[in-house]
Amino acid sequence: GSGIFQLRLQEFVNQRGMLANGQSCEPGCRTFFRICLKHFQATFSEGPCTFGNVSTPVLGTNSFVVRDKNSGSGRNPLQLPFNFTWPGTFSLNIQAWHTPGDDLRPETSPGNSLISQIIIQGSLAVGKIWRTDEQNDTLTRLSYSYRVICSDNYYGESCSRLCKKRDDHFGHYECQPDGSLSCLPGWTGKYCDQPICLSGCHEQNGYCSKPDECICRPGWQGRLCNECIPHNGCRHGTCSIPWQCACDEGWGGLFCDQDLNYCTHHSPCKNGSTCSNSGPKGYTCTCLPGYTGEHCELGLSKCASNPCRNGGSCKDQENSYHCLCPPGYYGQHCEHSTLTCADSPCFNGGSCRERNQGSSYACECPPNFTGSNCEKKVDRCTSNPCANGGQCQNRGPSRTCRCRPGFTGTHCELHISDCARSPCAHGGTCHDLENGPVCTCPAGFSGRRCEVRITHDACASGPCFNGATCYTGLSPNNFVCNCPYGFVGSRCEFPVGLPPSFPWVAVSLGVGLVVLLVLLVMVVVAVRQLRLRRPDDESREAMNNLSDFQKDNLIPAAQLKNTNQKKELEVDCGLDKSNCGKLQNHTLDYNLAPGLLGRGGMPGKYPHSDKSLGEKVPLRLHSEKPECRISAICSPRDSMYQSVCLISEERNECVIATEV
């Protein structure tokens, strides 16, 4: 129950041993009590004891004092438990009875007789203090006291507030007299179920499951979770925010694993060679004459420098070398010729010019060939033109440098910032922070590299028509429809077919005239360009060694808008007609000028959705036909092409889908 009405019987006096009817008890009044507790009544009436009733065993004969007894029969005070909110008022009827029968259960005996009764009506507040009273009539006197207390775990003025002290997963508290919770030390909250963390524990980065604890969230460490943890791959770096890798002094690279002072720390170069802190391993050895090898550890043969000219063969001798000259040549290095132009000495289409009144000659070699007789194929890579560990490649009449990650430029001489590697997915903005890239993610994405999508799927509603494939965009409500052949529009809702009343003849004539005009302009421009072009190597290499195929496949820079000067894309599909597929999903942070490429490869035929023009969105390029070749060349210093990737297609029927 929620509370207990307690009645303590103290003394009963019936000196003459009389019953209520005036008769006397023989041999004396063996007295027990019946107690009835009910709701307040102005006039006490018979009827059920609504708040409870209780009987005692025989407590004495005639007059007696009632002792307190806590257990068993004859318990005193008497307990009347109730299971409701105590109303504050009551009616109490106490009756004294005489029984001739059993002492322990007298209320069941026949022949019981009433000795006296008292009725108490009034108000009584819950409390521990006993209210004492005494009732007299002509024959008897009863002394007693009573009170109402709350049962265990019940509190408040009416015992209506339940509170059970606990110290477990659901709470850590004791109960105050009014029933409110009093948290145990180290706990807080409405139900005292929240631990008070270690003093100073960082509010966002730390938490606790028990008092005076400070457990760090991922990316944080230390007693108060106020120190970040560097990136997993970081080697010689620290952080100011989690997963960063800001290099210690003397270290570089994305994971601070490149020793910027390798030469000083390790002295790797042998035999008096010069060490420089560059190259793929963090150092490069420049050997003295007569030595070779990565660390200049190998001695060269005297013939290693190829001293014999005109096809002469070299033989090593103890301290020098000897050239065996082919027919028609003589001299220490076979440098003198006995031939003339009449002997047709120039190979590979070289033209012969007579010198010294016909006693000697000189060969003028076509591109790609060299040597006094044009007998050697040009290797433009012999001079090691590629810096920073770039790989030199002979490509027809020119050479190109294939740069290591982190470098660019004609000779790989330019260092790209870490952000140029585009570490941020989904259009995240990259910031270079002390050698470590940090991504600021757009709405709807999170994670160190913005790789985690945290919003609902904009494609879930199926916004694309005509069997188009839907891709979610950058912001939560963005989506992109990739239309099947024959449909266009931001939702692929428009078929490509033209209206029936289309004036075909007029349009055909108009288009024909426009095409003729364009061809005429192109011829004029081509002729002018040919006149302006210098034939020497320098001008040929000025465009970052573009192959002819690549030069033919450039979109004028005016049609592209560069919004991120750091971003570069290198796509090399090779010179064969291979299927480039999705171009490795390289994402450019550029805005595509409206109408650059509609579907079907016709610039500006169908306008893009207005929504896509004003905001940064990823542009993914992929060939939809295996015959298509997409070339893309970037040069950050090439002002002619405005530091953007110029992309084009080989054939008109090839389609480059632009998902914007």
Partner: antibody, heavy 118, light 107 residues
Framework: EVQLVESGGGLVQPGGSLRLSCAAS????????MAWVRQAPGKGLEWVAT????????YYRDSVKGRFTISRDNAKNSLYLQMNSLRAEDTAVYYC???????????WGQGTLVTVSS | DIQMTQSPSSLSASVGDRVTITCRAS??????LAWYQQKPGKAPKLLIF???ILADGVPSRFSGSGSGTDFTLTISSLQPEDFATYFC?????????FGQGTKLEIK
């Protein structure tokens, strides 16, 4: 190249003590939190203890609390695990690893075997 | 403690096969999950962290996905050197806990 080399393992009687060491190289040791992870023979992996990089805050799994102590000496690029009151269930290969209790373990040593048996 | 349950416990496959291993957490661990590869007598090697980020030097045939309680490790085309035991690990709650492992064997 990151290298973590454990030592100090061996056979010990129940109730005995052992001190494991881990020598680190190839990275700036003082910048990174470190941990011990163990693997009972033929069983899975179990995190044992962690120590932060700068203030040396330590955390332990409940079953080793009060018996094991993790510590570090940044000047010596070394991590330690003092194991007291050893029990048979502590028998395992003990790995030194770079990481915290709330991060992946990026680099691991080759491990050292601790056998607790009478 | 968070329980990590891997399935299957063992798996036979051939070179070139596509293989998927799953890992289930007893509570939501957000994206704080890593995958390790362990060869007999060797230390584990970190493959993937934060559910889907490849660790330095790990081949791109390995990929991870999932969030919350269900995660997968996929090897797109098995190579001979990929036969090993794979473990998942959560680091969202203390203590960090590992899966029991999936042994990948040659068929």
């Amino acid at each position: 190249e990151v290298q973590l080399v454990e030592s100090g393992g061996g056979l010990v009687q129940p109730g005995g003590s052992l001190r494991l060491s881990c020598a680190a190289s190839g990275f700036t040791f003082s910048n990174f939190p470190m941990a011990w992870v163990r693997q009972a023979p033929g069983k899975g992996l179990e995190w044992v203890a962690t120590i932060s990089s700068s203030d040396g805050t330590t955390y332990y799994r409940d079953s080793v609390k009060g018996r094991f102590t993790i510590s570090r000496d940044n000047a010596k690029n070394s991590l330690y695990l003092q194991m007291n009151s050893l029990r048979a269930e502590d028998t395992a290969v003990y790995y030194c690893a770079r990481g915290y209790y709330n991060s992946p373990f990026a680099y691991w040593g080759q491990g050292t075997l601790v056998t607790v048996s009478s | 403690d968070i329980q990590m349950t891997q399935s299957p416990s063992s798996l036979s496959a051939s070179v070139g096969d596509r293989v998927t291993i799953t890992c289930r957490a007893s509570q939501d661990i957000y994206y704080n999950l890593a995958w390790y590869q362990q060869k007999p007598g060797k230390a584990p090697k970190l493959l993937i962290f934060d559910t889907n980020i490849l660790a330095d030097g790990v081949p791109s045939r390995f990929s991870g996905s999932g969030s919350g309680t269900d995660f997968t490790l996929t090897i797109s085309s098995l190579q001979p050197e990929d036969f090993a035991t794979y473990f998942c690990q959560q680091y969202d709650y203390v203590p960090p806990t590992f899966g029991q492992g999936t042994k990948l064997e040659i068929k």
